[in-house]
Interface confidence: low
């Protein structure tokens, strides 16, 4: 055996010295395909003459008389050397164009060559092979292709990557899926399906390295193909918007003198679009800054928001302006596949201030007066003044924001509370200001789990109206797992506000929940019968923090308080 | 991004010479077969020549052989197509393209193109 | 050198019509034929390769077929965007050679 290995050996070195004196057509080292494959995995790698370098397949060549000759050079070493197809169970072997590691071995790293030729004709191409190991948790240094997924957009899918051709369509291989170390299954969004899997809903929380397990037998032995994708949630096409400059605006004018520096941001949002080029320029005068000449710096910052929305910001800067410069027209472009904009900077000369000591004076006196009256007006009448303004020019804000509900409200479940919450607080919210309030032991269908209906509502709700008293406390009440889920929506998304009322004093309290609520919360106080006062500050307290809503019965409670019928029966 | 960009077209007389430039980004110029196209005002595609990645080997149209000679500074990043003794019927618009697949004959990418006017 | 013949040479179609341009080799090219489409004053585009490959990024209503002499690109249902002229290119030998172009017009 080793004497025909030596044999075989001298025969290829022959080729390679006849090829040298002959000419051979290489086509170098295809660094463009880096492959890399796993130790103690199968590998099949393609000779890429065929794929990229010449117009005629493998068969056409074969059938032609060309003979396709394979052989290495290890790692570090400049001998090229024959690939000894003679190991034990065939790891190597060839097929027709492929070249066949079953499985591979660490020490297989190399550049590998694979030449056609025959007696007149020689073309050859030599491609890097790197066998890399992986831990336990698929963790390598291999390069991971990156799979995008839009956000909120249906169901979308992935493909376990590269398994094409590992084995013929009658075997069925058992195809396991892992999000970075842990197997998937019984996720919510994410379900596997064979060589695919499946995102019901791609959200932030599924960006990550996904791998496929691919398992298969052949020859009484099982083999194992791992495949690792990175996946990245991006901005979804439905909410691409054309590129929005937010500087230069109207609302800035750039004031200079001559000499001073002219510094102007042209900030630019654009949404992620797949394939997208997003450009940002500026023209001065309509010209290209380069195709004047002012001396002009343009330097440009790039950031990416977690769905790959861009922000460029590129500042203009011309070191000492003059007066010629501050009347040119500079003009912000921005363009994406979605559609182009562009932005004038308001740049003005700075006129001299004139001198005007006593007038100056008393200016001043007036304006500070003005301030201190406005100050103490503001502290005595601030509620009227923010629900005035609120009632005026606030913004719905619950227009399109997903919720159901206004208010989720938490209470003890006694006859005391429980009055205070149907009666009071609910006549007045629902009926009198137009707010939508759940209330669990209402609006709950009967037979559904508690802790996920309460979850639910809390989700779908805007404000989180704790009503506080003694009876709120006590350790493991329906109250407190609603006190904890709010808390914990506010503080890790935001998307919920916690409301503290307090219905009778509570005194010193072990539930952490509550202290740390207490500390960072404003709390109402109910002050009983001098509460249900119409203009009382506790219904005005409690409708600044409410959500503000446009509603058709809000009409003149915002400016009067309350009218007095909506409590006469409380 | 893959671009290609041609200037160096213009106005110039019968039996004058010009030299296009074509300059390339966003990919490894010395890996593709580069190749001038030209289109007659109003008329189809021609194509005029290519030049392998090492610039060993040219081809060209029958009807610019001797004249138009074809090269490349994979360096620089650039193709060149130096036009001498031209005439009226070689008034087009030039364009670079970039061979698929290292030298496949396809063309995967194109330049803006840049007019060629021979005209007395 | 070989010739290209395409027909027609201008096609009037409407929008979702299936349409499907012809083009002819002079002698036989096995599959060593692409197919690009060209909007006026632009550079054309690479629509098909090696007969019936598609370009990557080309929309899937586009496809081609033939081999030896016989080729034909087919759109499945017109787009506002498709109506362009469309050129055959044969690679099999130098010169590389164009089809004489088909213009594809609204009805």
């Known amino acids: 055996m080793t004497l025909l290995w030596c044999v075989v050996s001298l025969y290829f070195y022959g080729i390679l010295q006849s090829d040298a004196s002959e000419r051979c057509d290489d086509w170098g080292l295809d660094t463009m395909r880096q492959i890399q494959v796993f130790e103690d995995e199968p590998a099949r790698i393609k000779c890429p003459l065929f794929e990229h370098f010449l117009k005629f397949n493998y068969s056409t060549a074969h059938s032609a008389g060309l003979t396709l000759i394979w052989y290495w050079t290890r790692q570090d070493r400049d001998l090229e050397e024959p690939i000894n197809f003679r190991l034990p169970e065939n790891r190597i072997s060839k097929e027709k164009d492929v070249l066949w590691f079953r499985p591979t071995l660490l020490n297989d790293t190399g550049n590998y060559t694979c030449m056609l030729r025959n007696t007149t004709y020689c073309s050859k191409v030599a491609f890097p092979l790197e066998v890399v190991q992986k831990d336990s948790c698929f963790n390598s240094p291999m390069k991971l292709p990156v799979h995008k997924l839009y956000i909120e957009y249906g169901i979308q899918r992935i493909t376990c990557p590269n398994v094409d051709g590992y084995f013929p369509s009658s075997v069925k291989p058992t195809i396991t899926w892992y999000m970075g170390c842990y197997k998937i299954q019984n996720f919510n969004n994410v379900i596997p399906e064979g060589m695919n899997l499946s995102f019901l809903i791609a959200l932030i929380s599924n960006n990550g390295n996904y791998t496929c397990v691919v398992t298969y037998p052949e020859n009484g032995r099982t083999f194992h193909l791992t495949r690792t994708l990175t996946v990245k949630v991006v901005g979804s096409p439905k909410n691409a918007v054309p590129p929005v400059i937010h500087s230069p605006n109207d609302h800035v004018v750039y004031e200079k003198e001559p000499g001073e520096e002219l510094l102007i941001p042209c900030t630019v949002y654009f949404s992620f679009l797949m394939d997208s080029r997003n450009e940002v320029w500026w023209t001065i005068d309509g010209k290209k800054p380069d195709d004047i000449t002012i001396d002009v710096t343009i330097n440009e910052s790039i950031s990416h928001s977690r769905t790959e929305d861009e922000t460029r910001t590129q500042i203009l800067s011309i070191k000492k302006v003059t007066s010629e410069d501050l009347k040119r027209s500079y003009v912000c472009h921005a363009r994406s596949a979605k559609g182009e904009v562009a932005k004038a900077a308001k740049v003005k000369q700075k006129v001299p201030a004139p001198r005007y000591t006593v007038e100056l004076a008393c200016g001043f006196g007036a304006t500070v007066l003005l301030v201190v009256i406005l100050i103490v007006v503001y502290h005595v009448y601030w509620l009227e003044m923010v629900l005035f303004y609120r009632a005026h020019f606030g913004t719905d804000e619950t227009i399109l924001d997903g919720k159901e509900y206004d208010i989720y409200v938490s209470y003890a479940r006694n006859a005391e509370e429980e009055e205070f919450v149907l009666l009071t607080l609910r006549g007045v919210l629902e009926n009198e200001f137009g707010y939508k309030l759940c209330i669990f032991d209402r609006d709950s269908l009967p037979g559904g789990i508690v802790t996920d209906e309460t979850l639910s509502f809390i989700q779908k709700s805007r404000r989180l109206l704790v009503v506080l008293s003694p009876n709120y406390v006590l350790q493991g009440t329906q109250a407190l797992l609603e006190l904890k889920a709010g808390l914990e929506n506010m503080a890790s998304r935001g998307n919920i506000n916690v409301i503290l009322v307090q219905y009778k004093a509570v005194k010193e309290t072990k539930v952490k929940e509550l202290k740390r609520a207490k500390t960072v919360l404003t709390v109402i106080k109910w002050k009983g019968e001098k509460s249900k006062y119409p203009q009382g500050r506790f219904w005005k307290q409690l409708q600044v923090a409410m959500p503000v809503k446009k509603s058709p019965r809000r009409s003149s409670s915002d400016e009067q308080g309350l009218s007095y019928s909506s409590l006469k029966n409380v | 991004e893959v671009q290609l960009v041609e200037s160096g077209g213009g106005l110039v007389q019968p039996g004058g010479s010009l030299r296009l430039s074509c300059a390339a980004s966003g990919f490894t110029l010395s890996f593709y077969w580069m190749t001038w196209v030209r289109q007659a005002p109003g008329k189809g595609l021609e194509w005029v020549a290519n030049?392998?990645?090492?610039?060993?080997?040219?081809n060209f149209v029958d009807s610019v052989k001797g004249r138009f000679t074809i090269s490349r500074d994979n360096a620089k990043k650039s193709v060149f197509l130096q036009m001498n003794s031209l005439r009226a019927e070689d008034t087009a618009v030039y364009y670079c393209a970039r061979e698929g697949y290292f030298g496949s004959g396809y063309f995967d990418y194109w330049g803006q193109g840049t007019l060629v006017t021979v005209s007395s | 050198d070989i010739q290209m013949t395409q027909s027609p040479s201008t096609l009037s179609a409407s929008v979702g019509d299936r349409v499907t341009i012809t083009c002819r080799a002079s002698q036989s090219i096995n599959s060593w034929l692409a197919w690009y489409q060209q909007k006026p004053g632009k550079a054309p585009k690479l629509l098909i390769y090696k007969a019936s490959s598609l370009e990557s990024g080309v929309p899937s209503r586009f496809s081609g077929s033939g081999s030896g002499t016989e080729f034909t690109l087919t759109i499945s249902s017109l787009q506002p965007d498709d109506f362009a002229t469309y050129y055959c290119q044969q690679y099999n030998s130098y010169p590389h050679t164009f089809g004489q172009g088909t213009k594809l017009e609204i009805k």
């Open positions: 030049i392998k990645q090492d610039g060993n080997e040219k």
